[in-house]
């Protein structure tokens, strides 16, 4: 199987970042985030 590469350099100009909770260690499947300076991080 091919690997899915990951380049972590994101250019964000006051754009909201949205993550799925299951991607960041939760299995509840909810959308989560923390608002910091107009950008959602998780």
């Amino acid at each position: 199987d091919a690997e899915f590469r990951h380049d972590s350099g994101y250019e964000v100009h006051h754009q909201k970042l949205v993550f799925f909770a299951e991607d960041v260690g939760s299995n509840k499947g909810a959308i989560i985030g923390l608002m910091v300076g107009g950008v959602v991080i998780a």
């Epitope: 899915f4 990951h6 964000v12 909201k16 799925f20 909770a21 299951e22």
Partner: nanobody
Amino acid sequence: EVQLVESGGGLVQAGGSLRLSCAVSGGTFSSVGMGWFRQAPGKEREFVGAISRSGDSTYYAGSVKGRFTISRDGAKNTVYLQMNSLKDEDTAVYYCAARPAGTPINIRRAYNYWGQGTQVTVSS
């Protein structure tokens, strides 16, 4: 190499429906998040919506919320975009894309595999 192949595009009247499919091969389907983007003539490619690896969570751009639905079929390694109540402004080339887990679901750069796109034209 991971391959994404879209199908299902075409010409539809305003108010109509279309279902796009995206078949994924060459990778571990259950380990990646999938998203849909679109690009209208003369405009930048924009986020439409995304679905989680398990398929139990979805997220949509405001412009399509309530009209578009994304689902995924793990047995067929396929992601679907059901588009209802189509409008003229939905006319675009639609792309499916795959991203690694842990990356933003609504940022184009997070997605590192892309399909070739399928044209959707809405006529009034």
